[in-house]
Interface confidence: low
């Protein structure tokens, strides 16, 4: 009679995280008498996964009834697989011995690889706003996927970006991986409504990629333009001067009127007009009593936007 | 008869995202005849929220039956509140006119603030591993919360860290906010099993903070120590020299034996012994046929760990 062989028909098995993995093993003979065990890894550091003879292995079930007469099928199923279960599993036959059973023969091993989905990509923008024509960086991160092959692309308003750098960690073998990408985006004045999208494709997603988004409105500061003009007035002794503050973002804006360099009034912009591109306009006016002035008056509209250094525009009001 | 007053009894209302907000408004008189409207904001840029007379406002329901005779309650409820709904809401009475109704009187306004939970904190480690005694940075990010007040703490294995810097953005008023923190952690040899935790407390979490974690095993490289020794052998013409590679992490390791500078054997570490601290040990041996050598032999054990520059240890084998 030929000597017993331990047959593990699959060299490798790939399973999605959360599923069960079936590891198949068959013997070619009932002799010698003795138990079988399953191990992960080989050599002294191997990890016992299942022992037919004794022990409690809550995640392992046998595919057939091992105590049945003439049973030669020693396949097992491991439930609720996680990336940490990846490795090579060996089905090992022991020969009954005294006091201890003796290892007799091992199967060739079955490599279990675990497919795990990447987490939803998280896109983060710069901590500090920047103005148009400047470059800002956005990062995109996703974790916990396996296998390592993954594709990441960046888009701005549907247009693919090319200036980005991507790392997948760790570089060596691991139970799962992380991806980290940094994209550099040049801001334009029209970017208040713009969006950057980080798209991740992975074999586990069945063609339905994950997307993370960030709004450029969180990253941009569009400084205002100022225009000071005099409006016609019916009353002879009054002049109405307006300051038109245009195309700024974000909202936060404080305006101060100065007459010949002295503060006349300060106000905070509240009811703003929103432009189509997402920037805001605001108008403030100053009524000047011309009787109170002998000479010409220089009126200055001074605007502090989003905590930045003030900008101003002046207007010389002629007292005739 | 006293002139009609528009009463908005609450100066402010705070609502959790996803809930409904009730904005209360009552009139003191049925006269003048004309509809009411609700607006967010005041002035020219205000946004119509509800018009008693016409229009479709799917998220708005009236608290009482507005068409009922003698009704003076014009309170509304807005469903499924998001941070974008924050603002000051005005209940405005119009007087019937021709061709258009004319604004008659406004309530004092009710400020709606929205409480929104922070997203689960995402903790990211360095892209490249570092060795013990070096400092690495971890970042923690969370988004979408309101109000702005938030507390972030870092821990390493339960011990609070102090070397970190945190920003909450944007600096000005916003419908929701993001937090970004960077902690600097000094690695020690025992950190393979260590964890850093970012903990976020916010009013919306009712004292049950959110936590994000990262394992230092992804950030650390513990280089191996080497020891080369000769083992006793029964056979006279053979020498057994072992190279004990101790306390390294991560696993990836390649070992080369050299005899008098010439490569004798190269092997890749597979079955490793894991130490309690998470580092690994491995042993390789070389059988040297002493008959093949006239003079003493220098045996070198050369180890390349995790893609780093090789380290080596030599042993002089005396041929007697």
């Amino acid at each position: 009679e030929d000597e017993l062989q331990v047959i593990q028909p699959e060299k490798s098995v790939s399973v999605a995280a959360g599923e069960s993995a079936t590891l198949r093993c068959a013997m070619t003979s009932l002799i010698p008498v003795g138990p079988i065990m399953w191990f992960r890894g080989a050599g002294a550091g191997r990890e016992l996964i299942y022992n037919q003879k004794e022990g409690h292995f809550p995640r392992v079930t046998t595919v057939s009834e091992l105590t049945k007469r003439n049973n030669l099928d020693f396949s097992i199923s491991i439930s609720n697989i996680t990336p940490a279960d990846a490795g090579t599993y060996y089905c090992v036959k022991f020969r009954k011995g005294s006091p201890d059973d003796v290892e007799f023969k091992s199967g060739a091993g079955t490599e279990l690889s675990v497919r795990a989905k990447p987490s939803a990509p998280v896109v983060s923008g710069p901590a500090v706003r920047a103005t148009p024509e400047h470059t800002v960086s956005f990062t995109c991160e996703s974790h916990g996927f396996s296998p390592r092959d993954i594709t990441l692309k960046w888009f701005k308003n549907g247009n693919e970006l090319s200036d980005f750098q991507t790392n997948v960690d760790p570089a060596g073998d691991s139970v799962s991986y992380s991806i980290h990408s940094t994209a550099r985006v040049v801001l334009t004045r029209g970017d208040v409504h713009s969006q950057v999208i980080c798209e991740i494709a992975h074999i586990t997603l069945q063609g339905d990629p994950l997307r993370g988004t960030a709004n450029l409105s969180e990253a941009i500061r569009v400084p205002p333009t100022l225009e000071v003009t005099q409006q016609p007035m019916r009353a002879e002794n009054q002049a109405n001067v307006t300051c038109q503050v245009s195309n700024f973002y974000p909202r936060g804006l404080q305006l101060t009127w100065l007459e010949n360099g002295n503060v006349s009034r300060t106000e905070t912009a509240s009811t703003l007009i929103e432009n189509k591109d997402g920037t805001y306009n605001w108008m403030s006016w100053l009524l000047v009593n011309t009787c109170a002035h002998r000479d010409d008056v220089v009126l200055t509209c001074q605007v502090e936007h989003d905590g930045q250094q003030a900008v101003s525009k002046s207007y010389a009001l002629e007292i005739s | 008869e006293d002139e009609l007053q528009v009463i908005q009894p609450e100066k402010s209302v705070s609502v959790a995202a996803g809930e409904s907000a009730t904005l209360r408004c009552a009139m003191t008189s049925l006269i003048p005849v004309g509809p009411i409207m609700w607006f967010r904001g005041a002035g020219a840029g205000r946004e119509l929220i509800y018009n008693q007379k016409e229009g479709h406002f799917p998220r708005v329901t009236t608290v009482s039956e507005l068409t009922k005779r003698n009704n003076l309650d014009f309170s509304i409820s807005i469903s499924n509140i998001t941070p974008a709904d924050a603002g000051t809401y005005y209940c405005v009475k119009f007087r019937k006119g021709s061709p258009d109704d004319v604004e008659f009187k406004s309530g004092a306004g009710t400020e709606l603030s929205v409480r929104a939970k922070p997203s689960a904190p995402v903790v990211s480690g360095p892209a490249v591993r570092a060795t013990p005694e070096h400092t690495v940075s971890f970042t923690c990010e969370s988004h979408g919360f309101s109000p702005r007040d938030i507390t972030l703490k870092w821990f390493k294995n339960g011990n609070e860290l102090s070397d970190f810097q945190t920003n909450v953005d944007p600096a000005g008023d916003s419908v929701s906010y993001s937090i970004h923190s960077t902690a600097r952690v000094v690695l020690t040899r025992g950190d393979v099993h260590s964890q850093v935790i970012c903990e976020i407390a916010h009013i919306t979490l009712q004292g049950d903070p959110l936590r994000g974690t990262a394992n230092l095993s992804e950030a650390i490289r513990v280089p191996p120590t080497l020891e080369v020794t000769q083992q006793p052998m029964r056979a006279e013409n053979q020498a057994n020299v072992t190279c004990q590679v101790s306390n390294f992490y991560p696993r990836g390791l390649q070992l080369t034996w050299l005899e008098n500078g010439n490569v004798s054997r190269t092997e890749t570490a597979s079955t490793l012994i894991e130490n309690k601290d998470g580092t690994y040990n491995w042993m390789s041996w070389l059988l040297v046929n002493t008959c093949a050598h006239r003079d003493d032999v220098v045996l070198t054990c050369q180890v390349e760990h995790d893609g780093q520059q090789a380290v080596s240890k030599s042993y002089a084998l005396e041929i007697s």
Epitope: F155, G158, I197, E199, A201, Q206, G207, D208, P209, R211 | -
Partner: antibody, heavy 122, light 107 residues
Framework: EVQLVQSGAEVVKPGASVKLSCKAS????????MHWVKQAPGQGLEWIGA????????TYNQKFKGKATLTVDKSASTAYMELSSLRSEDTAVYYC???????????????WGQGTLVTVSS | DIQMTQSPSSLSASVGDRVTITCRAS??????LNWLQQKPGKAPKRLIY???SLDSGVPSRFSGSGSGTEFTLTISSLQPEDFATYYC?????????FGGGTKVEIK
């Protein structure tokens, strides 16, 4: 201009197989999933499955697993669908259409081939 | 699988009429819905993507609305060239599924 050009009509016997082709021109073939859709005479549209040319990754409607096999020839910018064990209920017009690998809404099912009529008859 | 229920299955209308076709998804698909037009013997043509975005070259009398599970295609003033069959298509989740179709015929 983007074009998807499909192979000509086929008349096949029950039990036989047929291989349909769809050649793409006017854009990068490999950036898109190529989808196949069935329309039986006088009936509506049914999604069969799709293939991604970069790595031949496929995704199928369970109903068509075992019936349809999707393949690509990247060098010829051509996608293929083989239908096996044909029966009379497989008589239909088969269309190829495409979507961008990344889920930008504007790129889903905008371009369609002209369709290939497969008639299964003894 | 996500089921797409389209109604009505057919309708008769005159040139100049306002026509509304609805599509209901068996679960939330966000805004990931296309509307397609198909004329006899021709391949389908996409009119609207992402629920409400009009494809270039499609007349502005076509519009789409909705989100989640309820979606509507409206033709504000039916023209002779609009008599065709219209399909909704969800692409939120594989397998991608079509509505049963609505045939718009001349009254």
């Amino acid at each position: 201009e983007v074009q998807l050009v499909q192979s000509g009509a086929e008349v096949v016997k029950p039990g036989a197989s047929v291989k349909l082709s769809c050649k793409a021109s006017g854009s990068t073939f490999t950036s898109y999933w190529m989808h196949w859709v069935k329309q039986a005479p006088g009936q509506g549209l049914e999604w069969i499955g799709a293939i991604y040319p970069v790595n031949s990754d496929t995704t199928y409607n369970q109903k068509f697993k075992g019936k349809a096999t999707l393949t690509v020839d990247k060098s010829a910018s051509t996608a293929y669908m083989e239908l096996s064990s044909l029966r009379s209920e497989d008589t239909a017009v088969y269309y190829c259409t495409r979507s961008f690998y990344y889920s930008l809404d504007a790129a889903w099912f905008v371009y369609w081939g002209q369709g290939t009529l497969v008639t299964v008859s003894s | 699988d996500i089921q797409m229920t389209q109604s009505p299955s057919s309708l008769s209308a005159s040139v100049g009429d306002r026509v509304t076709i609805t599509c209901r998804a068996s679960q939330d698909i966000g805004s990931r819905l296309n509307w397609l037009q198909q004329k006899p013997g021709k391949a389908p043509k996409r009119l609207i993507y992402a629920t409400s975005s009009l494809d270039s070259g499609v007349p502005s009398r076509f519009s789409g609305s909705g989100s989640g599970t309820e979606f509507t295609l409206t033709i504000s003033s039916l023209q002779p060239e609009d008599f065709a069959t219209y399909y909704c298509l969800q692409y939120a989740s594989s397998p991608f599924t079509f509505g049963g179709g609505t045939k718009v015929e001349i009254k």
